[in-house]
C-alpha cells in the first residue's frame, strides 16, 4: 500500500479552486476521468469526462467544470463559488467502471472558511514551499466560466468504490485515504 500525502487547500467562500491532475499519457490519454469527494469511507463521483473524443469539450456539473487535455496528460478541475460545505477530501481518478477507479496522485483536503473572499494583497511568496496557503494567489471571485466554448452538462454520479491497481496509487482499503498526513 502506498501512503497518500494530502495537500491541504485553504480558501474563502466565493473563491475558485483550480486543480491540475497529471496522468501517464500512454496509459490514460483515452480514459474517462472523474472528480470525486470522499463521503465517510465511500467516494462520490461529482463529475466525469465524456467518452474520449478528438475534440473534447469541458464538462460542467453545477459549479464544477472538468476539462481533459489528453495531448498534455492533464485534467483541469475548476470548482467555482466555493462554500463552507464544500470542505472535504477530493480526488482526481481515472474512471474505469462505476465499481473501479484509479486514483491520480495525492488527495486534496479542501478547507473553505467564511470571510472576505477578495484576493489578499499580501506579497509573502516563498517559492520554496509548494504547500503554502494560497494567500497570494487565491482565485477570482464567483463563477468564472463565462467562456463561449461548448460545455457539456452531465448529471451527478452515484457512489463508487476505489481500487487502484497499476502504476498509479495502490489502496488496499478506502480508509487509507482518511488517515494520511496533511501538509500545512
Amino acid at each position: 500500500t502506498t501512503e497518500l500525502t494530502e495537500e491541504k487547500y485553504e480558501y474563502k467562500e466565493g473563491q475558485t479552486l483550480e486543480v491540475k491532475c497529471d496522468y501517464a499519457l500512454e496509459k490514460y490519454a483515452n480514459s474517462r476521468k472523474a472528480w470525486q469527494k470522499m463521503e465517510g469511507k465511500m467516494p462520490k463521483i461529482l463529475a466525469k469526462t465524456e467518452r474520449p473524443s478528438e475534440n473534447s469539450h469541458p464538462v460542467q456539473v453545477g459549479r464544477i467544470t472538468l476539462e481533459d487535455y489528453p495531448d498534455h496528460g492533464l485534467l483541469q478541475v475548476r470548482m467555482t463559488n466555493l462554500q463552507v460545505e464544500d470542505s472535504g477530501l477530493y480526488q482526481c481518478v481515472i474512471y474505469q467502471h462505476p465499481k473501479e477507479s484509479h486514483v491520480l496522485f495525492n488527495p486534496i483536503c479542501l478547507v473553505v472558511t467564511k470571510g472576505s473572499s477578495g484576493t489578499p494583497g499580501s506579497s509573502e511568496n516563498s517559492t520554496q514551499n509548494v504547500y503554502r496557503t494560497p494567500s497570494t494567489t487565491a482565485k477570482a471571485l464567483g463563477p468564472r466560466y463565462t467562456s463561449p466554448r461548448t460545455v457539456t452538462q452531465a448529471p451527478p454520479e452515484s457512489t463508487v468504490v476505489v481500487s487502484t491497481p497499476g502504476s498509479e496509487i495502490n489502496l488496499t482499503n478506502v480508509t487509507d485515504i482518511i488517515r494520511v498526513p496533511v501538509f500545512n
Epitope: E7, Y9, T16, E18, V19, K20, C21, D22, Y23, A24, L25, E67, Y69, D71, H72, G73, L74, Q76, V77, R78, F105, N106, I108, T119, T127, Q128, V130, Y131, R132, T133, P134, T136, T137, K139, A140, R144, Y145, T146, S147, P148, R149
Partner: antibody
Framework: QVQLVQSGAEVKKPGASVKVSCKAS????????INWVRQATGQGLEWMGW????????GYVKKFQGRVTMTRDTSISTAYMELSSLRSEDTAVYYC?????????????????WGRGTLVTVSS | DTQMTQSPSSLSASEGDRVTITCQAS??????LNWYQEKPGKAPKLLIY???NLETGVPSRFSGSGSGTDYTFTISSLQPEDIATYYC?????????FGGGTKVEIK
C-alpha cells in the same frame, strides 16, 4: 543558490537530433514541474511542453509531438529535452523553466525560475 | 489554441512616464495570465502572476489588471532599467500561449 543550469550551445545539421540538459540546484527537483520554452531569433516565446520530474509524466504541444521527448534523471536533478528531425526553423534559444504553484496540484503556470537558455543552430 | 494579441509591439517613452501594455485573449482565460520581462541575452523574469499579483522582489511600479479576455500591464514611472521586452502568458487553457511581446525603449 536556486538555479537551473543548461548545457552549452549546439550546432546541428537538418535531420539530426539535439538533447539539451537542465540541471536544478538549490531546491527539491522533484517538487516542481519543468517546462520547456523556446525563442527563435527575433521571435516571441513558444511553450513546448512540461514534465513532472517526480513521476516522469509529460505533456507536449501538438506541434512538437512525435519529435520532442522530455526526460529526467532524478539522481542528478537534471531534466532533458530532446528534439529530433531538426529543421532550420528549429534554430532558437531553448529554455527550461520551473513551474511554481501554491500546491503541487494547483492549476497555476508561473515560471518563476528559468535557465539561461541553450542556443541550438540548425544549419547545413 | 488561445491566441494572445499584445499591443503595442513597441513603444518609446520618457523616463518617469506611465507605460501601458495590453493583452487580449481570443477567449476567456479566467484571470490566468502572467507578465514577464526579458532583457537581451537574459532569461525571462516573472513580474506579475494571476493577472494582478506582484512577484516577490519586483518593484511596485509594475502592476497588472484585467479580467475575461482583456488584460493590462502598467509601469507607473518608467526607469532606465525597465528597457526590455515584455510578454504576457495565458494559462487559462492549454496549450499555454504567449503574446507577441512589447519592446519598451526610452526616448
Amino acid at each position: 543558490q536556486v538555479q537551473l543550469v543548461q548545457s552549452g550551445a549546439e550546432v546541428k545539421k537538418p535531420g539530426a537530433s539535439v538533447k539539451v540538459s537542465c540541471k536544478a540546484s538549490g531546491y527539491t527537483f522533484t517538487s516542481y514541474d519543468i517546462n520547456w520554452v523556446r525563442q527563435a531569433t527575433g521571435q516571441g516565446l513558444e511553450w513546448m511542453g512540461w514534465m513532472n520530474p517526480n513521476r516522469g509524466n509529460t505533456g507536449y504541444v501538438k506541434k512538437f509531438q512525435g519529435r520532442v521527448t522530455m526526460t529526467r534523471d532524478t539522481s542528478i536533478s537534471t531534466a532533458y529535452m530532446e528534439l529530433s528531425s531538426l529543421r532550420s526553423e528549429d534554430t532558437a534559444v531553448y529554455y527550461c523553466a520551473r513551474r511554481r504553484a501554491v500546491y503541487r496540484s494547483s492549476w497555476e503556470w508561473y515560471f518563476d525560475l528559468w535557465g539561461r537558455g541553450t542556443l541550438v543552430t540548425v544549419s547545413s | 489554441d488561445t491566441q494572445m494579441t499584445q499591443s503595442p509591439s513597441s513603444l518609446s517613452a520618457s523616463e518617469g512616464d506611465r507605460v501601458t501594455i495590453t493583452c487580449q485573449a481570443s477567449q476567456d482565460i479566467f484571470n490566468d495570465l502572467n507578465w514577464y520581462q526579458e532583457k537581451p541575452g537574459k532569461a525571462p523574469k516573472l513580474l506579475i502572476y494571476h493577472a494582478s499579483n506582484l512577484e516577490t522582489g519586483v518593484p511596485s511600479r509594475f502592476s497588472g489588471s484585467g479580467s475575461g479576455t482583456d488584460y493590462t500591464f502598467t509601469i507607473s514611472s518608467l526607469q532606465p532599467e525597465d528597457i526590455a521586452t515584455y510578454y504576457c502568458q495565458q494559462y487559462g487553457n492549454l496549450p499555454l500561449t504567449f503574446g507577441g511581446g512589447t519592446k519598451v525603449e526610452i526616448k
